[in-house]
């Protein structure tokens, strides 16, 4: 029987979770890294949200003071790693370079839609989350995780795949987004920036966080990933923002301390099993959810993104280790491995809590509140 994660669970590794109050718009730091010249070509020319102000229209807001504690995310959707939408959902039998969905990179040729046409789809990820426009859905219950606390043996494979650092997860990690919405975890990976430059994939009101973790899951309705790709709800990703805090995060340190061993692109090592849930925020009840895509080729749509409102805290040294240790293709550092945010194109981001109810300066303006689409779930 699955038990929901209890609110009284201890915060991950040494007080690494964010505070319990959601991040209000007035608490958001200003976005300083936009536009990004590193964003993959072929994406920045996509149409933006015509009915929403652009980042340049957002008022600058001052960050929280240190004594107020860590930021919390109110709406963040997360992204995913690549796979192949055809029969072998991976790279098997993809022998022509033009067809090879591993043959892509951040910020360079080939344009992603040429690698996979789905990358030019209308419902892509990541997105910018605007809590004021999120639809509060009381039907969105706390996430349930089972089997995420792994013993040290068997060890797990940690690999620098040239696009991210990826931990392959064993069978048996079960996650439920709600009744009848059950998934099995496959892998987790991270997205990050560079020195002084944030690298989360999702943004909140234009604010980009230092890094982001994605735990990728396959629906139990599908036996194979290639069957699930592109099918609504076939894949689900749990995403959480990582930001700087005063203490070392002991859970993350179990992975970060091994990055030097896999500095080279394509290298791998074995790490003892660990508590995967400790890499996520402790509050499983407050999150944003929307339907999007993988954030890398093949960019398959139908992916359910669940972005935690609470952030995870890592020390400055840990964030530096993450962004400054690994090497990617072409003897270049593996940095800034995030995709540009994509237009919502009419999608509604749902929230499991009343994220849009706040007293921000813009609350005086008329805001069209979106209705919850999941009321019947």
């Amino acid at each position: 029987q699955r038990l929901p994660r209890m609110q009284e669970d201890s915060p991950l590794g040494g007080g690494s979770s964010g505070e319990d109050d959601p991040l209000g718009e007035e608490d958001l730091p200003s976005e300083e890294d936009s536009p990004r010249e590193e964003d993959p070509p072929g994406e920045e020319d996509l149409p933006g949200e015509e009915d929403l102000p652009g980042e340049e229209d957002l008022p600058e807001v001052k960050p929280k003071s240190e004594e107020e504690g860590s930021l919390k995310l109110e709406d963040l959707p997360t992204v995913e790693a690549p796979g192949d939408p055809q029969e072998p959902q991976n790279n098997a039998h993809r022998d022509k370079e033009g067809d090879d969905q591993s043959h892509w990179r951040y910020g360079g040729d080939p344009p992603w839609p040429r690698v996979s046409p789905a990358c030019a789809g209308r419902f892509q990820s990541p997105v910018d989350i605007r809590p004021q426009l999120a639809a509060f859905c009381p039907a969105l219950r706390p996430l349930e995780l089972l089997g995420f606390q792994l013993p040290p043996l068997p060890e797990l494979r940690l690999r620098n795949n040239g696009h991210s650092v990826q931990l392959t997860l064993p069978p048996g990690l079960e996650m439920a987004l709600g009744p009848g919405r059950e998934y099995r975890a496959l892998q987790l990976h991270l997205h990050w920036g560079a020195a002084g430059r944030p690298g989360s994939e999702h943004t909140v009101e234009g604010h980009r966080f230092p890094a982001e973790i994605h735990v990728v899951h396959l629906s139990t309705a599908f036996a194979r990933v290639d069957e699930a790709l592109g099918r609504p709800g076939g894949l689900a990703v749990l995403a959480a923002f990582l930001e700087e805090g005063p203490e070392e995060n002991s859970a993350y340190e179990q992975l970060l301390s091994r990055l030097e061993e896999i500095a080279e692109e394509g290298s791998e090592t074995q790490v003892p099993g660990l508590d995967i849930s400790a890499l996520l925020p402790s509050d499983f009840s407050r999150y944003f959810q929307y339907e999007g895509s993988l954030t890398t080729p093949p960019c398959a749509q139908g992916v359910i993104w669940t972005v935690f409102n609470q952030t995870v805290m890592l020390s400055a040294k840990q964030l530096h280790t993450l962004s400054d240790t690994l090497w990617g293709p072409g003897d270049s550092r593996l940095q800034l491995n995030f995709r540009a945010t994509q237009p919502l194109n009419g999608r509604v981001i749902e929230a499991s809590f009343p994220a849009g109810v706040d007293s921000s300066p813009r609350a005086a303006e008329p805001v069209q509140l979106n209705s919850c689409l999941a009321a019947g779930d």
Epitope: E80, A81, P82, G83, D84, P88, Q89, N90, N91, A92, D95, K96, E97, D100, Q101, S102, H103, L150, L153, P154, E155, L156, R157, R159, N160, N161, G162, H163, Q166, L167, T168, L169, P170, P171, L186, Q187, V216, L218, A223, R224, V225, E264, E265, G266, S267, Q270, G273, L294, T296, P329
Partner: antibody
């Protein structure tokens, strides 16, 4: 369709270095997501993984052979090579090169395709 | 190192028989298993990967299952071309193969 072909001497003297090359055709060895591997099979026995190389030059070896093994890659020739030093009769085997496929989405991996194999005999 | 033990080491069967081969890991493996078929004088050919995924072009009479330490390859209805040696392989800790199971004509 990618094909692999092993080449090298079929006879090596004890204490010498065994050298084999695998030529890849029908695809680029520089495509990410693939790990170029060597596997051997002693006569009438099972399969033993030797190690792999990524196009970037990153290698990963079987711990039991690590001290004697070097795998290298020449992307300009679309080839990768195996060197096994200080060989003995116990190294007599059919040596296969194979491509290890890596599914970046799931982390799953497996060997396909394989070369046809080349028999290397260690004898004086 | 993780050891992979296959059983039986050989099996005699007839065309149309259901054949089951098991593979046991010396410790639980966190990644997933692959199965290969090898015929005399030929290179191995992948049948199943990630425990249960059928490789493209492989007949559906082959199936795989299992998790943790115990894995199974099943041939639902043995065909003449299926007489061969079968190997399991794990990629959890480096890469290791089972010792093989020979499927012979009864």
């Amino acid at each position: 369709q990618v094909q692999l072909q092993e080449s090298g001497p079929g006879l090596v003297k004890p204490s010498q270095t065994l050298s084999l090359t695998c030529t890849v055709s029908g695809g680029s060895i520089s495509s990410g997501g693939y790990y170029w591997s060597w596997i051997r099979q002693h006569p009438g026995k099972g399969l033993e993984w030797i190690g792999y190389i990524y196009y970037s030059g990153s290698t990963y070896y079987n711990p039991s052979l690590k001290s004697r093994v070097t795998i290298s890659v020449d992307t300009s020739k679309n080839q990768f090579s195996l060197k096994l030093s200080s060989v003995t009769a116990a190294d007599t085997a059919v040596y296969y090169c194979a491509r290890e496929n890596y599914d970046i989405l799931t982390g799953f991996n497996w060997f396909d395709p394989w070369g046809q194999g080349t028999l290397v005999t260690v004898s004086s | 190192d993780i050891q992979m033990t296959q059983s039986p080491s050989s099996v005699s069967a007839s065309v149309g028989d259901r054949v089951t081969i098991t593979c046991r890991a010396s410790q639980g493996i966190s990644s997933w298993l692959a199965w290969y078929q090898q015929k005399p004088g030929k290179a191995p050919k992948v049948l199943i990967y990630s425990t249960s995924r059928l490789q493209s072009g492989v007949p559906s009479r082959f199936s795989g299952s299992g998790s943790g330490t115990d894995f199974t390859l099943t041939i639902s209805s043995l065909q003449p071309e299926d007489f061969a040696t079968y190997y399991c392989q794990q990629a959890d800790s480096f890469r290791t193969f089972g010792q093989g199971t020979k499927v012979e004509i009864k």
